[in-house]
Interface confidence: low
């Protein structure tokens, strides 16, 4: 599960690369595009036919410390009358992101990249019906 | 991971902030314990607000391939399979962190980068603006 090296078909390694101990990599956690903002339609989590709630998880040993997770409010979807239609399914849409995990071992600290699966929102789908013989 | 010695006054000198630059293990730890393995990956076709997935590839980034969702319709698919324009398909966007090679082309030197991706689409009731 190592990060693939740059393919030699693309580039030659520049001479200016910083020296890095074997088995590790240098990571600058000053985020590029830090101030970029999400410009989603207003209140889509409430206006959706598959509405969801947000929960903020917080961990001081994770960077970023805050990760927001969505949870679908219903099993079914909301119909035009505002009632839940259980012939349809609200399902989570998920996306992987990277975080940096800080680990303490006695008086030493180490850093590990970690994949985190974030539920971003929900969508309404037609269910897959399994017919049993 | 790569162990870094802490300050001499260890127990009392806990640094609450992350340093600007860290050395991390090349192995990425996968903690997808909350993943439902039965989750189908065809929601983009079965959704009432279906979307297409477009590939975005960049060898200077990890992951080098990211998939962008684009809603297929302005409206949503109704029970008859037709597009209902009284409802709107809208993208669900998410900021994610990726690794950017810095300096460029270096195999083991990265910087975190925040990028905005459209992950899928959802069907919403439109906001109707009444003009006086």
């Amino acid at each position: 599960r190592k990060i693939p090296k740059v393919g030699h078909t693309f580039f030659q390694k520049p001479e200016s690369c910083p020296p890095v101990p074997g088995g590790s990599m240098k990571l600058d956690i000053g985020i590029i595009n830090e101030n970029q903002r999400v410009s989603m339609s207003r209140n889509i989590e409430s206006r959706s036919t598959s509405p969801w709630n947000y929960t903020v998880t917080w961990d001081p040993n994770r960077y970023p410390s805050e990760v927001v997770q969505a949870q679908c409010r219903n099993l079914g979807c909301i119909n035009a009358q505002g009632k839940e239609d259980i012939s349809m399914n609200s399902v989570p849409i998920q996306q992987e992101t990277l975080v940096v995990r800080r680990k303490h071992q006695g008086c030493s600290v180490s850093f590990q990249l970690e994949k985190v699966l974030v539920t971003v929102g929900c969508t309404c789908v037609t269910p897959v019906i399994h017919h049993v013989q | 991971g790569i162990t870094i010695p802490r300050n001499p006054g260890c127990p009392n000198s806990e640094d609450k902030n992350f340093p600007r630059t860290v050395m991390v293990n090349l192995n990425i730890h996968n903690r997808n314990t909350n993943t439902n393995p039965k989750r189908s990956s065809d929601y983009y076709n079965r959704s009432t607000s279906p979307w297409n997935l477009h590939r975005n590839e960049d060898p200077e980034r990890y992951p080098s391939v990211i998939w962008e969702a684009k809603c297929r319709h302005l409206g949503c698919i109704n029970a008859d399979g037709n597009v209902d324009y009284h409802m709107n398909s809208v993208p669900i966007q998410q900021e994610i962190l990726v690794l950017r090679r810095e300096p460029p082309h270096c195999p083991n030197s990265f910087r975190l980068e925040k990028i905005l991706v459209s992950v899928g689409c959802t069907c919403v009731t439109p906001i109707v603006h009444h003009v006086a």
């Epitope: 693939p4 998920q94 994949k115 | 990425i28 996968n30 989750r39 189908s40 990956s41 065809d42 997935l53």
Partner: nanobody, 122 residues
Framework: DVQLVESGGGLVQPGGSLRLSCAAS??????MGWLRQAPGKEREFVAA????????YYADSVKGRFTISRDNSKNTLYLQMNSLRPEDTAVYYC?????????????????WGQGTLVTVSS
């Protein structure tokens, strides 16, 4: 769980071709991939394809030589391997996965077949 059965492996000369098949029991909408394990090496990613078959992704070492495809009506995944090299010798596995992020991470694949051996030798 989906059951996966690979076939089509065998002995082939360098420069030759093989077509591997993977039959899935029960319809799967999941993304699927081919991975391989050479003797004494870790399992590595070869190619992946989305549930619809629209999107494909290849390891650099096989790009331009291998083609992944699927026929959802037959619940079958394929790997067309051309211009085979001795270093392609391995047991080839097909597997399902949740989506096409981090395709090279073998740990993200869920259901695995038993594998089919491909030997490239003169």
């Amino acid at each position: 769980d989906v059951q996966l059965v690979e076939s089509g492996g065998g002995l082939v000369q360098p420069g030759g071709s093989l077509r591997l098949s993977c039959a899935a029991s029960g319809r799967t909408y999941d993304a699927m991939g081919w991975l391989r394990q050479a003797p004494g090496k870790e399992r590595e990613f070869v190619a992946a394809i989305s549930g619809s078959g629209d999107d494909t992704y290849y390891a650099d070492s096989v790009k331009g030589r291998f083609t992944i495809s699927r026929d959802n009506s037959k619940n079958t995944l394929y790997l067309q391997m051309n211009s085979l090299r001795p270093e392609d010798t391995a047991v080839y596995y097909c597997a399902t996965r949740r989506g096409l992020y981090y395709v090279w991470d073998a740990n993200d694949y869920e259901n695995w077949g038993q594998g089919t051996l491909v030997t490239v030798s003169s």
